[in-house]
């Protein structure tokens, strides 16, 4: 009866694959798939290149790369030839107002006067109370503090120059970086007299100076990297070896390891249940109930009521029960998953080149991002610079009559203004002209291009690896039947025939991702809105799109495997992959979870191992090493440790992503193999003996008793 029901379920997801005597793994005779999408993608790329050229012709990224003073003049050029550095009167206002979008569009502009200087201030200084009544000449010019805006009279009172923001009220020891003066050294600034309430100036100065010892820190960081780069590379080498070792050793230890990990999870859940019970018991005896608490948005308050712990206990108990039932009733599926993991380990061992394919993907991704960044930058800086009237404090007396944000001439600064600190500052680039008017659309095109190309590169990587690993599975006699260069042939095959299919899959994913980005943007804009209904709807939308993206990624991944094997178009491949997986949904879930668990542990092992080794080495805790292995003397020993850990994580992720792709490909091939073949002489199984054994199947022996080599 159960069998009949299963047959019905299977038929709901299509008929099992029929035997095809001509099938010998990844099809050799292919034709181009999704040609329309391929043409569309190539045209889009062509357009993207045109946008890049237009941006390059019209753009002027000097605005972002070279510093400009408040009047919009470049430092180090023209009238400021001898003044190459930009000094911000109040650098902290930059920190408070800078974000990635404003930097991309307007460069490092911030709401504080900026002046070109011949050298950055070397000493910490602040205007003393007794200097307010002195002249600008006495306080600034004669003391070689030539940091006021151009044209401030020598005999002007300092206090009025400060109120008009013509001169800086404090100076921090700075060093030039990107042509700008950035503060350094751990200085204790003298108290800023009379301006304790002036948030724009006093805002976090002491705290920020402590944390912004930029030059001092950067020099020390540079020194540390100079002393430890060799050992960081060694640590990354260790990460590489550990990752490889873990994957290759899986064929030996996959079974016991999975068992230990599952038991570990069971143990953690059991401890969780015990802990929740203890907490619940204590609070129950105290009589701490949710009814006493009432409704509160303070989540930490819920820790002190018994119902919270009871709910947690129930959830953990249910999870524990599910896991135990899975272990008891799905042990056969778990054994298949383990056998597939071992098979994947063998496949990687046979085709070690696949392990380094993520480098190709990484380089291609880097090219896509760099191209987009440069295009966006050049686009943002196309057109004539525009200047507007701006004041740091528009609520000052006398500012109410001034039309802030109206256009002005930077060469004609508004000295005749009743508004303190009124200036003509650079705002952005004009939208006159075809390119400038289309700027927003071109930027959108660029973002679309970025997402589409990134997704296409990732799709290419998945399809290439799938092709390589499929050629391993469908090799009847391993390793003799495996092609000589499986990775290269898969790469060429994918590029030549399936660019369109990959573009189609990538486009679907791109549209969902862009919808998510738009939603995130709307959510960001609505942050201040306290309407719970709106927030709830937004949350639901975001959740749905997140799920949709996850599903499409899963579907695409399996569609690319099918494309790599059969060379069919995207839709057919996606349908076939989906129906095949749905016919074996329990196996899919078990394999997916077991693989996730194993790869998570693998990452933990690699990153943890490298982290521990780095910690003991760089902190000088390993004694008795030879002279050649002596740890360097460092200012911040955590720096190379963190670098090593992050590097190890990147390397492990790269390797395990290949392994994950390998498992998925072999799994799909295995399911195909089960449906396509029956173990007879003309329809033998391609799977390994261990998988056959688990399934209780075997291949018929040929008449001459020649057994096939596995």
């Amino acid at each position: 009866m159960g069998g009949k029901q299963r047959d019905k379920d299977d038929e709901a997801y299509g008929k099992p694959v029929k035997y095809d005597p001509s099938f010998r793994g990844p099809i050799k005779n292919r034709s181009c798939t999704d040609v329309i999408c391929c043409v569309l993608f190539l045209l889009f790329i062509l357009g993207y290149i045109v946008v890049g050229i237009v941006a390059w012709l019209y753009g002027d990224p000097r605005q972002v790369l070279y510093p400009r003073n408040s009047t919009g003049a470049y430092c180090g050029m023209g009238e400021n030839k001898d003044k190459p550095y930009l000094l911000y009167f109040n650098i902290f206002s930059c920190i408070l107002s800078t974000n990635i979008i404003s930097v991309a569009e307007n460069g490092l502009q911030c709401p504080t006067p900026q002046v070109c200087v011949s050298s950055c201030p070397e000493d910490p200084w602040t205007v003393g109370k007794n200097q307010f009544s002195q002249t600008v000449g006495e306080v600034f010019y004669t003391k070689n503090r030539n940091f006021c805006l151009p044209g401030v009279p020598w005999n002007m009172m300092v206090i009025t120059s400060l109120q008009q923001e013509l001169c800086p009220s404090f100076l921090l020891p700075s060093a030039p970086a990107l042509g700008r003066c950035f503060p350094w050294t751990n200085v204790t600034l003298p108290e800023l007299p009379g301006i304790t309430n002036d948030t724009t100036i006093a805002q976090g100065i002491s705290g920020l100076i402590d944390s912004l010892n930029a030059r001092d820190i950067s020099v020390k960081i540079f020194e540390d990297f100079a002393h430890s780069w060799y050992w960081i590379l060694v640590a990354l080498g260790v990460a590489l070896l550990l990752s490889l070792l873990f994957i290759l050793l899986l064929r030996l230890v996959a079974g016991p390891l999975v068992l230990v990990l599952i038991l570990g999870v069971l143990g953690v859940l059991a401890y969780g249940i015990y802990y929740c019970w203890e907490e619940y018991r204590v609070l129950r005896d105290k009589g701490a109930s949710i009814s006493q608490l009432g409704f509160t948005t303070n989540l930490s308050a819920y820790q002190s009521v018994q119902e919270t712990w009871l709910a947690a206990l129930i959830v953990l108990a249910v999870l524990e029960a599910i896991l135990l039932l899975v272990l008891i009733f799905l042990r056969q599926r778990i054994r298949i998953a383990i056998a597939l993991l071992k098979e994947a380990s063998k496949a990687v061992g046979q085709m070690m080149s696949t392990m380094f394919y993520p480098l190709v993907t990484f380089v291609l991704l880097l090219i896509c991002i760099a191209y987009w960044a440069m295009t966006a930058l050049y686009l943002a800086t196309s057109g004539q610079p525009q200047y507007v009237l701006w004041a740091s404090n528009i609520s000052s007396p006398g500012c109410e009559k001034v039309s802030i944000n109206t256009s002005c001439n930077p060469m004609d600064q508004p000295v005749n203004s009743s508004c303190p600190g009124l200036m003509c500052v650079f705002q952005g680039y004009s939208s006159k002209g075809l390119v400038q008017r289309s700027l927003f659309n071109l930027q959108i095109y660029g973002v679309l291009g970025l997402f589409w190309t990134l997704n296409w590169v990732l799709a290419l990587g998945q399809c290439v690896l799938a092709g390589a690993f499929a050629s391993f599975y469908w090799a009847f006699h391993k390793p003799q039947d495996i092609p000589t260069f499986p990775l290269i042939s898969a790469f060429i095959r994918t590029l030549r025939y399936h660019t369109g299919s990959l573009a189609f899959g990538a486009l679907i994913l791109t549209l969902v991702q862009i919808a998510r980005v738009i939603l995130e943007y709307i959510d960001h804009k609505l942050r201040g809105v306290q309407n719970p209904v709106a927030r709830c709807i937004m949350c639901c939308f975001k959740c749905c799109l997140w799920c949709l993206e996850k599903f499409i990624k899963f579907l695409n991944r399996n569609a690319y495997i099918m494309i790599a094997i059969y060379g069919k178009n995207f839709c057919v491949s996606a349908k076939n992959a989906f129906t095949l997986l749905m016919r074996n949904i329990v196996r899919v879930v078990v394999l997916d979870k077991v693989t996730d668990l194993l790869l998570f542990f693998g990452k933990l092992l690699v990153v943890g191992g490298v982290g521990v080794l780095s910690f003991f080495f760089f902190s000088g805790r390993i004694q008795g090493l030879g002279r050649d292995f002596k740890s360097p003397h460092l200012n911040y020993y955590w720096l190379p440790i963190m670098t090593s850990i992050m590097g190890a994580y990147v390397i492990a992720s790269g390797f395990f992503s290949v392994f994950g792709m390998c498992v998925d490909t072999l799994f799909l091939c295995f399911l195909e193999d089960l449906e396509r073949n029956d173990g007879s002489l003309d329809r033998p199984y391609y799977m390994s003996k261990s998988l056959l054994k688990i399934l209780g199947k075997k291949n018929e022996a040929p008449p001459d008793n020649k057994k096939r080599k596995k």
């Epitope: 007794n130 307010f132 009544s133 002195q134 005999n155 006398g398 000295v415 303190p420």
Partner: antibody, heavy 125, light 107 residues
């Protein structure tokens, strides 16, 4: 209430010296800058000198630079103007005036707000 | 040094009239300008500071405006006690300087 009273004026021969005083009351003298302003007979006001609250910063009009010295004694709440090498054109009513800026209010600078009644100086041979 | 000029140098007006006096600085002084009123034989009295802010105790019929180099003092409804000489003064650049004054007398 805030009050400034000038004294020390009189008739003096050219080339001689004179010292004017200004007694302040009703406010914290040591927190404010103080000015001397003069007015020649039938003419407009002419700013002479300023001394800031602690006496460290002093500034003068070009016409009196090098000849006049402004000083203050915060313990006595008194402002002084030492006038040397007097000339006929120095003949005027001399007013002392308080500067509204107390040295604490960074945000705005107001200029002079309270004036004395003046003392007359006549330079004549 | 900054030169301050006032116009007119004198004007005759009747009680209830609206009077406007202008003051010009030889270079930009932002809003660091004060207006003083002086009656014959008396000490000057501060009316306006910061070009437009009224000193405490000064009636609202006095108002000031302007910035940079051009400033005005307006008396909306002239009263007998308002007949006096009015001076403007800049106080941002040393030496501080006064305008020559504008004498307002009864027509």
């Amino acid at each position: 209430q805030v009050q400034l009273v000038e004294s020390g004026g009189g008739v003096v021969q050219p080339g001689r010296s004179l010292r004017l005083s200004c007694a302040a009351s009703g406010f914290t003298f040591s927190s404010h800058g103080m000015h001397w302003v003069r007015q020649a007979p039938g003419k407009g006001l002419e700013w002479v000198a300023v001394i800031w609250y602690d006496g460290s910063n002093k500034y003068y009009a070009d016409s009196v630079k090098g000849r006049f010295t402004i000083s203050r004694d915060n313990s006595k709440n008194t402002l002084y103007l030492q006038m040397n090498s007097l000339r006929a054109e120095d003949t005027a009513v001399y007013y002392c005036a308080r500067d509204a800026y107390s040295g604490y209010d960074y945000y705005y600078y107001y200029g002079m707000d309270v004036w004395g009644q003046g003392t007359t100086v006549t330079v004549s041979s | 040094d900054i030169q301050m000029t006032q116009s007119p140098s004198s004007l005759s007006a009747s009680v209830g009239d609206r009077v406007t006096i202008t003051c010009r600085a030889s270079q930009g002084i932002y809003t660091y300008l004060a207006w003083f009123q002086q009656k014959p034989g008396k000490a000057p009295k501060s009316l306006i500071y910061g070009a437009s802010s009224l000193q405490s105790g000064v009636p609202s019929k006095f108002s000031g405006s302007g910035s940079g180099t051009d400033f005005t003092l307006t008396i909306t409804s002239l009263q007998p006690e308002d007949f006096a000489t009015y001076y403007c003064q800049q106080y941002t650049i040393y030496p501080f300087s006064f305008g020559p004054g504008t004498k307002v007398d009864i027509k």
